[in-house]
C-alpha cells in the first residue's frame, strides 16, 4: 500500500530446545484488540494457522502445534511447549479489530553439543609423510544450530596452511533437527610433536550467550627412524661384583629398533653378543669382575636394513680377590713372636684390617699384624678384612688360627652337678690346648669327643647315677704330647633345699651341664683366662 | 629386467639446489628399500642416502645430513634426491641403487647415473 | 664412524694369475649371533657402473664368476681372483653396513 511504513525487523525470542518460549503478541491497544487474535507460523514465507483467540480464550488449530500451546499473561502471550531445532521459525499475531494489524517475532532455538569426543589416529603418522595425515578426529554431537571447531597443538590453535594442515569438517543432521559435527584434523608432522597434545574446541550459543567445551588432549604415535643409540647402566656410580647391573640399550626412533648388546673380547677383537632378556636388557646378577669390558648395542632399523652402532661404553665392575694370610695356620711357642701377611688384589686401592676373632677388636689398620711375647690366651682366631674404602660394602676377609703349644687346658677345675639316684646323667667336660689334646674318664659309660675347633675338644659321657659314683664323683682328663690336666664333678643328690643356685654349681635336673663360668688348669699354678676367652 | 634411469643432473652454483629423479621399472618398486650413492669424479664410492619401501625411514651420511631429502612416489615408481645448499664438494654421478631381498644392506641394482656439477 | 681401508690402492696381474685384494676395518664386522660379517664386495668396470659381488663378506651374488672369492672374518677381508681374465679388469670396492655404509678407497686392478 503506497505510503504505508516499511514492515519493522520481528522481535527475536531466544530459547534452548526442550524448554518454553514464551510469544508475546506486541499490538498496542489501538493496533488491535488483544481479545481477539489469531496466531500463525511462518515456514518457507508460507503462514499457518496454529492459534486463534476469542473473548480472551485460546483454541489450538489442529496440526504439529496442537498440543504444545497455551494462553498465559491475560492471553497476551503464547507459550510454546518442549521447543525442537524446527520450532525456529517466523511466529506472528494478527489482531482482528478495529483493523488488521500484525506483529511478528523471530524464535531462534539453541542446543549445546554434548562434551567433544576425540579420537586418536591409532596407526599413527610417519614424519616423512607426503601429504598431512590423519592426526585425530573430533565429533560434537546434538547440537544446535551446528557448533564451530577450532583445534589445538600444545594449547596454541592450529590454521589451515598448505600442505602442512588441513581440516576437514562435515555435518549430519539427526531425526531430532540436531547437528553432529565430525572434524578431522589433518597434518604433516615433525620428529618434535611426539609429545604434543592436542584437542579440539566446539564453540555454540545459547540464550545466555556464547560458550565452549573442550575435548581431552591427546597424543598421536610419531614415528621417525632411529638416528642415535647409546647405552645406559644401571646403577650409576661404582659397581661391585654382587651388584645386580643392567645395562639397557636406547633410541631415538619410534618405534624402538632391534637391539643387540655386545661385549668386546680383548683377545680376538671381536665382539660378542649378549644374551639379553625380552627387553632387550643385559641383565648382571650378580656381576662378577669378568662382566668388566667394552659394551656397544648394535640397532637394526628392519625398514631399510641400516644398521647403527652406538659408542661403546667401559663397565668397570669392581671387585676385591680371595685374601691370603700368611702363614696359613701358624703354631707358636708361648713367648715367642709372629707377623701375619695379608694379601689382596682389587680394582681399586684397598684398605687391610686385622681383628680378633672372638671379639672383633680392631688390632692393626694394615696389612701386617705383628705378635709378640705370645701368651697361651693369644691362640685363636685373627681375622683379616680388604675393603675398598670408595666403595661401601666391597670386602673379602680371611680367617686364621693361631695355635700356642702347650698342656691342656681344663674348661673347668672342679664343678657340682645335682642329680637324682638312677637317672641316667648327661657329663660333659672340655679342654685345649695344642697339639689338640684327648678327654679320658675314670668311670664305664658311653663317652661321645666332638672337635670345637683345632685346639679345643668336648666330650660327653652317658653314665647311671649310682650310690658308688655318688661317693666318689667323675674325673676327666686331657692329655696331649705336653702333658695332662684333670676335672672333677662332684655329684650331689638333690632336695628341696639344695635348689638354690650357687656361682659356681649347676642347678637343676638338666641332663646337660651348663657351660662354665670360669676355666681352670689343674696344674700347680692355678690361671684364670681374660674374661672374653670364657665360653659362658 | 630391472631398470633404473637417473635424470635431473646438470650445472648448479654453490649454495643452489638440484632434484634428481629415478625412474624404476621391471619390479615391484613399492616393496624395495632405496638409495642414492655418489662417486665425484675419479674418486670412489660415497653413500648418500637411504629409504624404506612405504617411505617413511630415511637416512644419511654426516655429510649431506640436513641438506639432502630422499623421497618415493611409488604410485609413480619413482625415487628422488632434493639436494639444497649445494657446495663444490657434492659434485659427482649420483646412482639410484635398488636393496635386494638378503637380510644385509646390498645396493643389488644399479642406474647408469646422472652428473651433478657444482661450480661457480 | 667405522673407517675401510683397502690395499693395496692398484694391482698388476698377469692373465690367469692369481689377485689379491685386502680390506681392514677399524673395527669388527662380525655379528657373533648370526656368525655373520657385514662386508661386500662391489665391482666396478671402467665406464659402467658399481656391480655387486660378494656380500656377508663371502656369500657369492648369484650370476658371479667362482673364480671370485670373499673370504676372512672379524676386522681383515680378502677378495680373491683365483684365474684373472681380461674382464676382470676394474676397480674393486669393499663396504660395511654395521655402523650405517661405507665404503673403501678401492683397489684398481690391471692386467700385467
Known amino acids: 500500500v503506497p505510503g504505508e511504513a516499511e514492515q519493522p525487523a520481528p522481535e527475536l525470542v531466544e530459547v534452548e530446545v526442550g524448554s518454553t518460549a514464551l510469544l508475546k503478541c506486541g499490538l498496542s491497544q489501538s493496533q488491535g484488540n488483544l481479545s481477539h487474535v489469531d496466531w500463525f507460523s511462518v515456514h518457507k514465507e508460507k503462514r499457518t494457522l496454529i492459534f486463534r483467540v476469542r473473548q480472551g480464550q485460546g483454541q489450538s488449530e489442529p496440526g504439529e502445534y496442537e498440543q504444545r500451546l497455551s494462553l498465559q499473561d491475560r492471553g497476551a502471550t503464547l507459550a510454546l511447549t518442549q521447543v525442537t531445532p524446527q520450532d525456529e521459525r517466523i511466529f506472528l499475531c494478527q489482531g482482528k479489530r478495529p483493523r488488521s494489524q500484525e506483529y511478528r517475532i523471530q524464535l531462534r532455538v539453541y542446543k549445546a553439543p554434548e562434551e567433544p569426543n576425540i579420537q586418536v589416529n591409532p596407526l599413527g603418522i610417519p614424519v616423512n609423510s607426503k601429504e598431512p595425515e590423519e592426526v585425530a578426529t573430533c565429533v560434537g554431537r546434538n547440537g544446535y544450530p551446528i557448533p564451530q571447531v577450532i583445534w589445538y597443538k600444545n594449547g596454541r590453535p592450529l590454521k589451515e596452511e598448505k600442505n602442512r594442515v588441513h581440516i576437514q569438517s562435515s555435518q549430519t543432521v539427526e531425526s531430532s533437527g540436531l547437528y553432529t559435527l565430525q572434524s578431522i584434523l589433518k597434518a604433516q608432522l615433525v620428529k618434535e610433536d611426539k609429545d604434543a597434545q592436542f584437542y579440539c574446541e566446539l564453540n555454540y550459543r545459547l540464550p545466555s550467550g556464547n560458550h565452549m567445551k573442550e575435548s581431552r588432549e591427546v597424543t598421536v604415535p610419531v614415528f621417525y627412524p632411529t638416528e642415535k643409540v647409546w647405552l645406559e647402566v644401571e646403577p650409576v656410580g661404582m659397581l661391585k661384583e654382587g651388584d645386580r647391573v643392567e645395562i639397557r640399550c636406547l633410541a631415538d626412533g619410534n618405534p624402538p629398533p632391534h637391539f643387540s648388546i655386545s661385549k668386546g673380547n680383548p683377545s680376538t677383537r671381536e665382539a660378542e653378543e649378549e644374551t639379553t632378556n625380552d627387553n632387550g636388557v643385559l641383565v648382571l646378577e650378580p656381576a662378577r669382575k669378568e662382566h668388566s669390558g667394552r659394551y656397544e648395542c648394535q640397532a637394526w632399523n628392519l625398514d631399510t636394513m641400516i644398521s647403527l652402532l652406538s659408542e661403546p661404553q667401559e663397565l668397570l665392575v669392581n671387585y676385591v680377590s680371595d685374601v691370603r694370610v700368611s702363614p696359613a695356620a701358624p703354631e707358636r711357642q708361648e713367648g715367642s713372636s709372629l707377623t701375619l701377611t695379608c694379601e689382596a688384589e682389587s680394582s681399586q686401592d684397598l684398605e687391610f684390617q686385622w681383628l680378633r676373632e672372638e671379639t672383633d677388636q680392631v688390632l692393626e689398620r694394615g696389612p701386617v699384624l705383628q705378635l709378640h711375647d705370645l701368651k697361651r690366651e693369644a691362640g685363636g682366631g685373627y681375622r683379616c678384612v680388604a675393603s675398598v674404602p670408595s666403595i661401601p660394602g666391597l670386602n673379602r676377609t680371611q680367617l686364621v688360627k693361631l695355635a700356642i703349644f702347650g698342656p691342656p687346658w681344663m674348661a673347668f677345675k672342679e664343678r657340682k652337678v645335682w642329680v637324682k639316684e638312677n637317672m641316667v646323667l648327661n657329663l660333659s667336660c672340655e679342654a685345649s690346648g695344642h697339639p689338640r689334646p684327648t678327654i679320658s674318664w675314670n668311670v664305664n659309660g658311653t663317652a661321645s669327643e666332638g672337635d670345637q675347633d683345632p685346639q679345643r675338644v668336648l666330650s660327653t659321657l652317658n653314665v647311671l647315677v649310682t650310690p658308688e659314683l655318688l661317693e666318689t664323683g667323675v674325673e676327666c682328663t686331657a692329655s696331649n704330647d705336653l702333658g695332662k690336666n684333670t676335672s672333677i664333678l662332684f655329684l650331689e643328690l638333690v632336695n628341696l633345699t639344695t635348689l638354690t643356685p650357687d656361682s659356681n654349681t649347676t642347678t637343676g635336673l638338666s641332663t646337660s651341664t651348663a657351660s662354665p663360668h670360669t676355666r681352670a688348669n689343674s696344674t700347680s699354678t692355678e690361671r684364670k683366662l681374660p674374661e672374653p676367652e670364657s665360653r659362658g | 629386467e630391472v631398470q633404473l634411469v637417473e635424470s635431473g643432473g646438470g650445472l648448479v652454483q654453490p649454495g643452489g639446489s638440484l632434484r634428481l629423479s629415478c625412474a624404476a621399472s621391471g619390479f615391484t618398486f613399492s616393496s624395495y628399500i632405496m638409495s642414492w650413492v655418489r662417486q665425484a669424479p675419479g674418486k670412489g664410492l660415497e653413500w648418500v642416502a637411504t629409504?624404506?619401501?612405504?617411505?617413511?625411514?630415511?637416512y644419511y651420511p654426516d655429510s649431506v645430513k640436513g641438506r639432502f631429502t630422499i623421497s618415493r612416489d611409488n604410485a609413480k615408481n619413482s625415487l628422488y634426491l632434493q639436494m639444497n645448499s649445494l657446495r663444490a664438494e657434492d659434485t659427482a654421478v649420483y646412482y639410484c641403487?635398488?636393496?635386494?631381498?638378503?637380510?644385509?644392506?646390498?645396493?643389488?641394482?644399479w642406474g647408469q647415473g646422472t652428473m651433478v656439477t657444482v661450480s661457480s | 664412524d667405522i673407517v675401510m681401508t683397502q690395499s693395496p690402492d692398484s694391482l698388476a696381474v698377469s692373465l690367469g694369475e692369481r689377485a689379491t685384494i685386502n680390506c681392514k676395518s677399524s673395527?669388527?664386522?662380525?655379528?657373533?649371533?648370526?656368525?655373520?660379517?657385514?662386508l661386500a664386495w662391489y665391482q666396478q668396470k671402467p665406464g659402467q657402473p658399481p656391480k655387486l659381488l660378494i656380500y656377508w663378506a663371502s656369500t657369492r651374488e648369484s650370476g658371479v664368476p667362482d673364480r671370485f672369492t670373499g673370504s676372512g672374518s672379524g676386522t681383515d677381508f680378502t677378495l680373491t681372483i683365483s684365474s684373472l681374465q681380461a674382464e676382470d679388469v676394474a676397480v674393486y670396492y669393499c663396504?660395511?653396513?654395521?655402523?650405517?655404509?661405507?665404503f673403501g678407497q678401492g683397489t684398481k686392478v690391471e692386467i700385467k
Open positions: 673395527r669388527s664386522l662380525l655379528n657373533s649371533r648370526i656368525r655373520k660379517n657385514y
Open positions: 629409504i624404506s619401501s612405504g617411505g617413511s625411514s630415511t
Open positions: 663396504k660395511q653396513s654395521y655402523n650405517l655404509l661405507t
Open positions: 641403487t635398488r636393496d635386494d631381498d638378503y637380510d644385509v644392506k646390498v645396493f643389488a641394482y
